[in-house]
């Protein structure tokens, strides 16, 4: 058993039929010694008396706020939380595996640019008595400071049958060095606790493996002269990290028919202009990538031919 | 460039881009098999890293930027002589047209454009290398790799801004 | 074409070293380890060891250690292995192979130690 | 040391027959695993790496198989050309060991 935050305790059980549980001894926060009496949630039923109450947990039916009184009074409370163990590993119920880029891929985040700051989300299929709690760091031994707000929800989808719903939080390393090669990774660690099932989720990752740019801005068509061809211009988009000269991106520019059949042409150019040929009906998308180092490509910012 | 002179950043430039994309194609290289699981021992965590405080930053670069260059040639020496050792030259044979062969020269080439014969910076960091294992070796070379190609993005980016703002 | 040719049958008097030679030719003589094996007369293959041409590192088998030395010249794509202090036990032919999954070994190099 | 076990020792076929040579390691090698035949008077020839993967050069009736600690190599229908010593041999680690080998004869 550990202490989640004040009054709130996670209990560890290897989840199979039969399991013998672990036993756990609340102490009733008071100065008090007798005439102590303990109850479970809501209920009036009297579990025991005194200052300690000694208890087997075994399943969620063990699990919730226990509470000590005194003469009608309530003296403190102990909320109790189960942490399950399937098969000697933490069960994964309450957020949805996103299967990107890997199996057992629950925490997904991303940053626009080098300064520390990244976003990451998770799914779950659950809308109610549900909390999430995010803690980070960069490294794990002798961690460095990051500092994330609180997660919330950010989107709600519907899948088939289901809602699905995304929540998300927004992380900052304190002491960020955008220049400097990464050697040590930033961990991530989600709280989830649904009613009195705790579950906890984490990930690990450079910022470097994380990072899109947002889409080029300004995406524009000039016409060349007594020609098919145009001349395409873009800029870098606001949000990536400056100079330019130093944070360098590399481009693709594609030209799509209306028909996905269509063939794409592309090119690839590390300047913020190109020259294509403009189909009849066709758009003309660019997208953004880290030039010196393969991480993900922006989204597309597109322009119709015509 | 030892002794304050100033590196051919352009040459610089082209040939560190050059180190990004044969980093990130030699990567797929894992050999005879999959790479089963990475692993969590620490396989590469004496590699030099450009620091916080290596000056390779844009005002670090503008302020003396022999700091940030020795700092990478001292990275290229490192990993040119990783990639020499039998981490790469043993069992599970690399084929003979592997990116990692020219990944190699060009490492050379760029840290022979910083110090070229004759100029010295002091001594370098050199990899302890005992002889790896052939069943570690592939999980190695992922890791070595994987952390090449952060270093050279790095690198590529001094390189590029030193080209941008600091040539002649 | 791959080949390792090396160098002819050697008789030697108990005591006496010897230097055998192994030149590489059709690749990249520093891309690959050379490692030498040792075959007595109508028995099994033994790994003496190997040496890296790029930077000479070698690596022996604890069996062979003292009893072998293995060098290299990259001028000349040679790798060498010298045995010293020989005895009958160390009559054999021995050779030279390139990586183990590359299927390239030398003719070999007979040694026979007799008084 | 990890210590490669051949059987049989030797082993007499008829041209045509199927035939499967036993590799054991004393400790589980992966797939580590290479297999050569050593003709009377010839250097030893590479036939199979990594437990089953064929080389070029080597005609496909030899064929690699298992994982772990126990490896055979099959002939599916041998030949007068193929007597001669089959040797397997540990690739995981060092020291690198050789089986004892498996002749094999033609009746």
């Known amino acids: 058993i550990w202490e989640l935050k004040k009054d709130v305790y996670v209990v560890e059980l290897d989840w199979y039929p039969d399991a013998p549980g672990e036993m756990v001894v609340l102490t009733c926060d008071t100065p008090e010694e007798d005439g102590i009496t303990w109850t479970l949630d809501q209920s009036s039923e009297v579990l025991g008396s005194g200052k300690t109450l000694t208890i087997q947990v075994k399943e969620f039916g063990d699990a919730g706020q226990y509470t000590c009184h005194k003469g009608g009074e309530v003296l403190s409370h102990s909320l109790l939380l189960l942490h399950k163990k399937e098969d000697g590993i933490w069960s994964t119920d309450i957020l949805k595996d996103q299967k990107e880029p890997k199996n057992k891929t629950f925490l997904r985040c991303e940053a626009k640019n080098y300064s520390g700051r990244f976003t990451c989300w998770w799914l779950t299929t659950i809308s109610t008595d549900l909390t999430f709690s995010v803690k980070s760091s960069r490294g794990s031994s002798d961690p460095q400071g990051v500092t994330c707000g609180a997660a919330t929800l950010s989107a709600e989808r519907v899948r088939g049958d289901n809602k699905e719903y995304e929540y998300s939080v927004e992380c900052q390393e304190d002491s960020a060095c955008p220049a400097a090669e990464e050697s040590l990774p930033i961990e991530v660690m989600v709280d989830a606790v649904h009613k009195l099932k705790y579950e906890n989720y984490t990930s690990s990752f450079f910022i470097r493996d994380i990072i899109k740019p947002d889409p080029p801005k300004n995406l524009q068509l000039k016409p060349l002269k007594n020609s098919r061809q145009v001349e395409v211009s873009w800029e870098y988009p606001d949000t990536w990290s400056t100079p330019h000269s130093y944070f360098s991106l590399t481009f693709c520019v594609q030209v799509q028919g209306k028909s996905k059949r269509e063939k794409k042409d592309r090119v690839f150019t590390d300047k913020t202009s190109a020259t294509v040929i403009c189909r009849k009906n066709a758009s003309i998308s660019v997208r953004a990538q880290d030039r010196y180092y393969s991480s993900s490509w922006s989204e597309w910012a597109s322009v119709p031919c015509s | 460039v030892p002794g304050g002179s100033s590196p051919a950043w352009t040459q610089c430039q082209q040939l560190s881009q050059k180190l990004c994309t044969l980093a990130w194609s030699a990567h797929p290289l894992v050999g005879h098999m999959d790479l089963r699981e990475e692993g969590d021992e620490e396989t590469t965590n004496d590699v030099p890293h450009i620091q916080c405080g290596d000056g390779c930053d844009p005002q670090g670069l503008r302020d003396n930027s022999q700091f940030c260059l020795q700092r990478i040639h001292q990275g290229l020496i490192f990993y040119e002589k990783l990639l020499g050792s039998d981490i790469f030259t043993g069992e599970p044979s690399l084929l003979p047209d592997s990116p990692v062969g020219q990944l190699h020269a060009s490492l050379l080439g760029l840290s022979q454009l910083l110090q070229p014969e004759g100029h010295h910076w002091e001594t370098q960091q050199i990899p302890s290398l005992s002889p790896s294992q052939p069943w570690q070796r592939l999980l190695l070379r992922f890791k070595i790799l994987r952390s090449l190609q952060a270093f050279v993005a790095v690198a590529a980016r001094v390189f590029a801004h030193g080209a941008a703002t600091l040539s002649p | 074409e791959v080949q390792l040719q090396q160098s002819g049958p050697e008789l030697v008097k108990p005591g006496a070293s010897v230097k055998m030679s192994c030149k590489a030719s059709g690749y990249t003589f520093t891309r690959y380890l050379m490692h030498w094996v040792k075959q007595k007369p109508g028995q099994g293959l033994e790994w003496i060891g190997y040496?890296?041409?790029?930077?000479?590192?070698?690596n022996y088998n604890e069996k062979f250690k003292g009893k072998a030395t293995l060098t290299s010249d990259k001028s000349s794509s040679t790798a060498y292995m010298e045995l010293s202090s020989l005895t009958s036990e160390d009559s054999a032919v021995y050779y030279c192979s390139l990586n183990w999954d590359y299927a390239y070994w030398g003719q070999g190099t007979l040694v026979t130690v007799s008084a | 040391d990890i210590v490669m076990t051949q059987s049989p020792a030797t082993l007499s076929v008829t041209p045509g027959d199927r035939v499967s040579l036993s590799c054991r390691a004393s400790?589980?090698?992966?797939?580590?695993l290479h297999w050569y035949q050593q003709k009377s008077h010839e250097s030893p020839r590479l036939l199979i790496k990594y437990a089953s993967q064929s080389i070029s050069g080597i005609p496909s009736r030899f064929s690699g198989s298992g994982s772990g600690s126990d490896f055979t190599l099959s002939i599916n229908s041998v030949e007068p050309e193929d007597v001669g010593v089959y040797y397997c041999q540990n690739g995981h680690s060092f020291p690198y060991t050789f089986g004892g080998g498996t002749k094999l004869e033609i009746k």
């Open positions: 040496i890296n041409p790029y930077n000479d590192g070698t």
């Open positions: 400790q589980s090698i992966s797939d580590y």
